[in-house]
């Protein structure tokens, strides 16, 4: 093992470099020391280090992990910051062309519903909008309100049109009446299938991304232990006490100190591979029922289909709703 | 048959099309983004190795530091590091993650158990009864357009295919177009050169 | 310390098929996308497509679809690809290379393998 | 397929000196652009990635900045050694598509 050079006797590169970290050098010794009072560089001879520069070195190796873990993620936090909000504008798009797509079915085949369904078409969707975003909504609810809300208009305007519109009285019992016998079929029932199963995927691909930017954040920002501080301040800068300015730490003694210091972050991997894999099983799965695009972008043909269903029982529906709601519609009349 | 609407043109600032022929939809995004993401499948156990890679290490010198001395690269107390009587590596470990860093196990397991319960099982196809009336969807067959269920005459495909080149503007009030969301960009030559150290020779 | 060997240089018949090999070592084989990239003699640098070696998926740049197969032998970590109905066209210097860990960039290259193809 | 048109194609400099590349994608690439150095003989070597992200053990002299469409690389205090093609990549897509190359010689 070759002797350790004789360290500078004036401890003048030592001041130079130091003069970068912290200008100003009241710290530096002008020639050698003891350095009895040193707790990380611990000397074996004379030392141009101080204990306030051992402070500092501690200071920067810390600042120096933060900005090496900040440049490791910087593409991927990219990635995934840039593809969530991509994606949760995209989502949006998607919602609002719905919801055009459904009040231009409105407009262009029931003109007589226009007003009112283009109000519940439009709360239905934010509703939609707000799910998506992991408000607590509850998308049978969601979807039953829409009907409940709809039928109404459609019997007063299209069944029966020689009824009053303002009567609260028989709008109250339509909407009971609209569940009991299953006005719209089971159209409710299939539209609440597609809606939820897509509209949960949707969510958590979202809260996943979004947890993705949370980890890497996380990690980004990670505060390092005091120990982990000493062990790279000695790796890093302990040579410089003893004049080595040119040297380098040893490739092996850096990969353990490392994963010392990074113990506890790694011990995220097995988490995050779990996470990329399951991540990219979700997006397999995301098609037909389960690819909001789809769903939403076909219901106002649904929503359509569902409103021929009511007018092709019309004669039988008219009759059984003339009876269950006569005390409403009596009232009404009057 | 109901009016179907004209064909859905989206603001290309939101997705780019990826070929003028074949426009990007929302599927093939989420398939890129799942592409690339793999490819950081390795990020958290390589970091250790990218920090090392990324601060000065002797690589070509004859002489290293080891922590308390300057030794030869490839002599035995090259790797072991100079730290007796100081604190061991091994309790170092043994500490466990940082608090932050348990948390952050701890929803990213939340998460995985959320989305392994979401992956549905490929080739599921609704289910056709649709009312007791006996009236059922079309067959969508696997070659087909994606569609959805609706009744008889009254079914459409839709094309799961939104081109994002302009926002669709009806006879109708609608909407406006997003504004153009903020992308952070990285800061050119941010953290190129080791802090105050890379050039001190 | 990451290294990607190629397969040494070949001189085949036009027709049949030639397969080149990407023997890698340093690092965790599984873990990261194995590109490959054509240069023809002159010319810039196209890519044909990748191999990811966690599952086996392939991605490829359509203009190669029916020209190049990529596979792999998970317990030697290396790569391979095969190109079929040989032209003078296919004659060029093919690369390897990695990608993953901290970019979806290619961040380490094989020395490359000259395929001249010639009657 | 994004193109990317690489200038100039080919450029000669004095030692000491610096120069300038520049690569004009056909859209935007989200700063998912790469850089690299091409010797004969050998592969390509990564010297820039995510538009100004230092590979390890390149030397500061080497830079890269740009984002939307445009983007260029530079190397000052020119040495003996950076003699060589330059390439750049874009890697926004997934179908990979790589500048033409500017081969940099010695005045």
């Known amino acids: 093992q070759p002797p350790p050079p004789p360290p500078d006797a004036t401890c003048h590169q030592v001041r130079s470099f130091f003069q970068r970290l912290q200008p100003g050098l009241k710290w530096v010794p002008e020639t050698p020391v003891p350095g009895s009072d040193l707790q990380v560089c611990l000397p074996k001879g004379p030392t141009c280090c101080s204990r306030k520069m051992e402070e500092k070195y501690q200071l920067t190796a810390r600042l120096n992990m933060e900005q090496l873990l900040q440049s490791a993620s910087m593409e991927l936090k990219f990635l995934i910051i840039q593809n969530a909000a991509v994606f949760q504008e995209a989502f949006e798009i998607v919602v609002r062309h719905a919801k055009n797509y459904t009040n231009a079915m409105f407009k262009n085949n029931y003109p007589s519903l226009t007003p009112q369904a283009f109000e519940f078409v439009g709360e239905f969707f934010t509703d939609v909008s707000l799910y998506i975003l992991g408000s607590d909504i509850n998308v049978d609810d969601m979807v039953n309100e829409l009907f409940d809300s709809l039928f109404p208009v459609i019997y007063t305007q299209l069944m029966n049109p020689g009824l009053p519109d303002s009567a609260l009285d028989i709008n109250e019992c339509l909407r009971g009446a609209r569940r009991d016998l299953k006005v719209f079929g089971n159209f409710p029932k299939l539209i609440m299938t597609q809606v939820s199963k897509s509209l949960q995927v949707t969510r958590i691909f979202l809260q996943a991304l979004n947890l993705g930017i949370e980890v890497i954040n996380t990690t980004d920002h990670l505060k390092f232990s005091k120990d982990c501080g000493r062990m790279l301040t000695r790796m890093w800068y302990c040579s410089y006490c003893q004049g080595l300015m040119m040297v380098k730490p040893c490739g092996g003694y850096c990969n353990v100190v490392m994963q010392g210091c990074m113990a506890g972050v790694v011990e995220i991997d097995k988490y995050w591979r779990e996470y990329i894999l399951s991540l990219e099983e979700l997006v397999n799965g995301m098609y037909r029922i389960y690819d909001m695009e789809n769903v939403l972008l076909g219901l106002f043909s649904t929503i359509h289909d569902s409103i021929q269903y009511v007018q092709k029982n019309a004669g039988k529906l008219t009759t059984t709703i003339g009876k269950l709601c006569a005390h409403s519609q009596q009232r009404q009349y009057r | 048959s109901a009016y179907y609407p004209e064909d859905l043109f989206i603001d290309k600032k939101v997705l780019k099309v990826a070929h003028v022929e074949h426009e990007e939809t929302l599927s093939s995004r989420r398939r890129e983004l799942i592409q690339k993401l793999k490819s950081f499948i390795s990020f958290y156990s390589a970091l250790p190795g990218y920090i090392c890679s990324h601060s000065p290490v002797a690589e070509n010198d004859t002489l290293c530091w080891n922590g308390q001395e300057l030794v030869e690269r490839y002599s035995q107390k090259a790797a072991r590091n100079g730290m007796k009587n100081q604190f061991n590596l091994h309790e170092l470990k043994m500490k466990g993650p940082e608090p932050v860093v348990s948390q952050i196990i701890d929803k990213l397991k939340h998460i995985n158990q959320l989305l392994r319960t979401m992956s549905m099982p490929k080739g599921r196809v609704l289910d056709k009864n649709l009312d007791e009336e006996g009236f059922e969807s079309g067959d969508c067959g696997d070659d087909e357009d994606e569609c959805i269920g609706g009744s008889g005459d009254g079914m459409i495909k839709v094309k799961n295919q939104l081109r994002f080149l302009a926002e669709l503007a009806y006879d109708l009030d609608v909407d406006d177009a997003p504004g153009n969301s903020q992308q952070a960009t990285p800061k050119d030559n941010e953290i190129s050169t080791f802090h105050n150290l890379g050039n001190v020779h | 310390e990451v290294q990607l060997q190629q397969s040494g240089p070949v001189m085949v018949k036009p027709g049949p098929s030639v397969k080149i090999s990407c023997q890698t070592s340093?690092?965790?084989?599984?873990?990261?996308?194995i590109h490959w990239v054509k240069q023809s003699h002159g010319k810039s640098l196209e890519w044909i497509g990748l191999v990811f070696p966690y599952d086996g998926g392939t991605n490829y740049n359509q203009k190669f679809k029916d020209k190049a197969t990529l596979t792999l032998d998970t317990s030697s970590s290396t790569a391979y690809m095969e190109l079929n109905s040989l032209t003078s066209e296919d004659s060029a210097v093919y690369y390897c290379?990695?990608?993953?860990?901290?970019?979806?960039?290619?961040?380490?290259w094989g020395q490359g393998t000259s395929v001249t193809v010639s009657s | 397929d994004i193109q990317m048109t690489q200038s100039p194609s080919s450029l000669s400099a004095s030692l000491g000196g610096k120069v300038t590349i520049t690569c004009k994608a056909s859209?935007?690439?989200?700063?998912?652009i790469a850089w690299y150095q091409h010797k004969p003989g050998k592969g390509p070597r990564l010297l820039i990635h995510f538009t100004s992200t230092l590979q390890p053990g390149i030397p500061s002299r080497f830079s890269g900045s740009g984002s939307g469409r445009d983007y260029s690389f530079s190397i000052s205090n020119l040495e003996p050694e950076d003699i060589a093609t330059y390439y750049c990549l874009q890697y926004d897509n997934l179908l990979l598509t790589f500048g033409a190359g500017t081969k940099l010689e010695l005045k």
């Open positions: 859209q935007d690439i989200n700063n998912y």
């Open positions: 340093g690092f965790t084989f599984t873990d990261y996308y």
């Open positions: 290379a990695r990608a993953g860990g901290f970019s979806y960039a290619l961040n380490y």
